[in-house]
Amino acid sequence: DASGDLLNTEAHSAPAQRWSMQVPAEVNAEAGDAAVLPCTFTHPHRHYDGPLTAIWRSGEPYAGPQVFRCTAAPGSELCQTALSLHGRFRLLGNPRRNDLSLRVERLALADSGRYFCRVEFTGDAHDRYESRHGVRLRVTAAAPRIVNISVLPGPAHAFRALCTAEGEPPPALAWSGPAPGNSSAALQGQGHGYQVTAELPALTRDGRYTCTAANSLGRAEASVYLFRFHGAPGTST
């Protein structure tokens, strides 16, 4: 396995022609982003138009757990997804055109590892091939970023504040504001993977409320202001 090479080309002999698979040695991406795992292949079955299955697995070739699988009916260029782990994997390539490239959405650090593509011809040309070396996906950590901060109406004419941040490792969120002691208790809930949301359930005073997100790579801040027209029937921000 020439892991230093930009491309791994794997092949075995077949009568007159060859199976081969081309995958990059490595793909790098940041947590929270998407990554494309390229995989193209050649095969000895010229003009094969029968049913086929495209598979991606993680961990180890041949035996690792499948993260994606789709099947294409005879003559069809549509590969119908049968499995997409957590709904984050989708085929970018067209297996009929020898392309099994896969897109992985909403990357987390735990997605780091080796991925292996496989194609199975399941018609008259009963044959299959799988990448032995695979492509290594390296997901790098991401500094915190506040993606949303807002004040919303709450019960009994009160207001609440929401702060959503993303980062990997997931950042810790803290609210600070004009309340005595300059900080307020926040309800923090785990969001989707790399996203975290914290709620300040009751804004008792006017002023500036600041959400701080921090992880091992850094910190981010964003503020929201609350001003109420006291005595007026319609309170506003």
């Epitope: 002999s13 299955t53 041949y62 499948q66 496989r118 199975e120 399941t122 009963h126 299959r128």
Partner: antibody
Framework: EVQLLESGGGLVQPGGSLRLSCAAS????????MSWVRQAPGKGLEWVST????????YYADSVKGRFTISRDNSKNTLYLQMNSLRAEDTAVYYC???????????????WGQGTMVTVSS | DIQMTQSPSSVSASVGDRVTITCRAS??????LAWYQQKPGKAPKLLIY???YIHSGVPSRFSGSGSGTDFTLTISSLQPEDFATYYC?????????FGQGTKLEIK
């Protein structure tokens, strides 16, 4: 626990029928091709039949073609082998086996049941 | 059908010995070969798949090699629990076929 448990074996007269079952647990049954492999007393292993993960395709050894039928119920995580027109040479321990890593191909059999004995004798 | 021929059919060895079992296919099967171990009254256990990949939980003293038509299973240092019958099996094409088996006995 990941396991396969066969049942349904027994003594049957030549020309008779039996239905073997294999209950799977501990893995996503529908994602894997499943097979039956048999072993006559004191002999080696013989592949009998394979069915794909979704049941789309079935394959048989020539020695059982037309007499045996493999099927699966993915809602019950169970594999079956219906054996008709049984002959003395079908006497064997029958194992169900799971394919490694694929719903269509059996690159290898990575999980085996304990086996169930089928004896065809008058 | 693809014929699989194992040799030897039986072998006697001692604990600590290095043992090699060979399997020959009647036609090119690429790397689609598996090795199994079977003990009396028990189901077979997968040792090696796709010619050279060691199945999880299998001791590293077992190794497989080869491609095309000639394959080898090697046990680098025999342990008492290794005395059993070993089978090769091709998964290149249906019907899947097994070798006749190699019985590994204590010398």
């Amino acid at each position: 626990e990941v396991q396969l448990l066969e049942s349904g074996g027994g003594l049957v007269q030549p020309g008779g029928s039996l239905r073997l079952s294999c209950a799977a647990s501990g893995f996503t049954f529908s994602s894997y091709a499943m097979s039956w492999v048999r072993q006559a007393p004191g002999k080696g292993l013989e592949w009998v039949s394979t069915i794909t993960g979704g049941g789309e395709s079935t394959y048989y050894a020539d020695s059982v073609k037309g007499r045996f039928t493999i099927s699966r119920d993915n809602s019950k995580n169970t594999l079956y082998l219906q054996m008709n027109s049984l002959r003395a040479e079908d006497t064997a321990v029958y194992y169900c086996a799971k394919a490694i890593g694929s719903s269509w191909y059996s690159d290898a059999f990575d999980l085996w049941g304990q086996g169930t004995m089928v004896t065809v004798s008058s | 059908d693809i014929q699989m021929t194992q040799s030897p059919s039986s072998v006697s060895a001692s604990v600590g010995d290095r043992v090699t079992i060979t399997c020959r296919a009647s036609q090119d099967i690429s790397s689609w070969l598996a090795w199994y171990q079977q003990k009396p009254g028990k189901a077979p256990k997968l040792l090696i798949y796709v010619a050279s990949y060691i199945h999880s939980g299998v001791p590293s003293r077992f190794s497989g090699s080869g491609s095309g038509t000639d394959f080898t299973l090697t046990i680098s240092s025999l342990q008492p629990e290794d005395f059993a019958t070993y089978y090769c099996q091709q998964s290149y094409s249906i019907p899947y076929t097994f070798g006749q088996g190699t019985k590994l006995e204590i010398k």
